[in-house]
Interface confidence: low
């Protein structure tokens, strides 16, 4: 790297994966090996992050950027980052100190994250429930008792919910 | 399934050039570190160079001003362009994902170049 | 850059015995620190990596320990499948300060 010509700052001119080497009289230096800056005039390059134990590699390192994490298989992320990775439970679980525990009778989970949500109390809308809940599914609210008089017609439940990524057929 | 393939080795004379392929599947190629090992016969694994994450580039003295790697990201492949090939070139040659974290984690099958008159 | 000395460069051993490979640095590598296993004709399987952590699907008889410029690699119950050579890897060359195999040591069975 050429020593830095800038009047003002000799630093500003040390691009990104470089740093402004004080013990080389401001000389642009390479960062060395596990460490990145992401922006030019650094003094110092950042160390990079390891993903190890339960954090897997979902970007590497280089030279002008930190490594990326995620979780690995069992475990999903949380925090900016992916600071943290907390164990996934089944779907009709939620995750409590003492581990993985069945949602309760009234409560449901769909999915491997998260709380066991109160099934939709379906009389509030004045309306029935039409399918029931499990500890995986919400219930299913259909129309009221009193739209089902004679000659009314018959019910149609909700199309299911598709997955993300599948087109209708 | 999560998988390298090399292709494109063969003989070549000295002086020649040569481009080889490593193709991934089941993953991101952009999201590793790519790496070029070669292995001479009888001999033991020598790195060749790798491209970061970033793009950047790093060689090997050895091979330093005649081989460049590049990679196709809407591909998913990585080459390796070797030029003025020189007969202690001769190896099989292996792609490998690698990186900080892991080391090289995956590799390929490895492809054969020879060169020689 | 960065050398990296495997020793021995072969040994033959009877099944069932503990085997020991080492590998010196030239520098201090901060454990990043990969063994692979070859078998003729076939492409290096990675067993170690961070210097002594296990990868996924190897089994339990292979370890590894070291820190600074000083590992080991370990075979604890030599097994006819081990026959192989093994490599040690220093694989952290974020500013190109050159990624080193040891020279590898061949595995035989008496």
């Known amino acids: 790297f050429e020593r830095t010509r800038s009047l003002q700052d000799p630093c500003s001119n040390c691009p990104a994966g470089t740093f402004c080497d004080n013990n080389r009289n401001q000389i642009c230096s390479p960062c060395p090996p596990n460490s990145f800056s992401s922006a030019g005039g650094q003094r110092t390059c950042d160390i990079c992050r390891q993903c190890k134990g339960v954090f897997r590699t979902r970007k590497e390192c280089s030279s002008t950027s930190n490594a990326e994490c995620d979780c690995t298989p069992g475990f999903h992320c949380l925090g900016a980052g992916c600071s943290m990775c907390e164990q996934d439970c089944k779907q009709g679980q939620e995750l409590t100190k003492k581990g993985c525990k069945d949602c309760c009778f009234g409560t449901f989970n769909d999915q491997k994250r998260g709380i066991c949500r109160p099934w939709t109390n379906c009389s509030l809308d004045g309306k029935s429930v039409l399918v029931n809940g499990t500890k995986e599914r919400d219930v299913v609210c259909g129309p009221s008792p009193a739209d089902l008089s004679p000659g009314a017609s018959s019910v149609t439940p909700p199309a299911p919910a598709r997955e993300p990524g599948h087109s209708p057929q | 399934e999560v998988q390298l393939v090399e292709s494109g080795g063969g003989l070549v004379q000295p002086g020649r050039s040569l481009r080889l392929s490593c193709t991934a599947s089941?993953?991101?190629?952009?999201?590793?570190?790519m790496s070029w090992v070669r292995q001479a016969p009888g001999k033991g694994l020598e790195w060749v160079g790798y491209?970061?994450?970033?793009?950047?580039?790093y060689y090997a003295a050895s091979v330093k001003g005649r081989f460049t790697i590049s990679r196709d990201d809407s591909k998913s492949i990585a080459y390796l362009q070797m030029n003025s090939l020189k007969t202690e070139d001769t190896a099989v040659y292996y792609c490998?994902?690698?990186?900080?974290?892991?080391?090289?984690?995956?590799w390929g099958q490895g492809t054969l170049v020879t060169v020689s008159s | 850059d960065i050398v990296m000395t495997q020793s021995p460069s072969s040994l033959s051993a009877s099944v069932g015995d503990r085997v020991t490979i080492t590998c010196q640095a030239s520098e201090d590598i901060s454990s990043y620190l990969a063994w692979y296993q070859q078998k003729p004709g076939k492409a290096p399987k990675r067993l170690i990596y961070g210097a002594s952590d296990l990868a996924s699907g190897v089994p339990s008889r292979f370890s590894a320990s070291g820190s600074g410029t000083d590992y080991t690699f370990t075979i604890s119950s030599l097994q006819p499948e081990d026959i192989a050579t093994y490599y040690c890897?220093?694989?952290?060359?974020?500013?190109?300060?050159?990624?080193?195999f040891g020279g590898g040591t061949k595995v035989e069975i008496k």
């Open positions: 890897h220093y694989y952290a060359t974020i500013s190109g300060l050159g990624v080193a």
């Open positions: 490998a994902r690698g990186g900080l974290t892991y080391g090289f984690d995956l």
């Open positions: 491209i970061d994450v970033g793009g950047s580039l």
């Open positions: 089941g993953f991101s190629l952009n999201d590793y570190w």
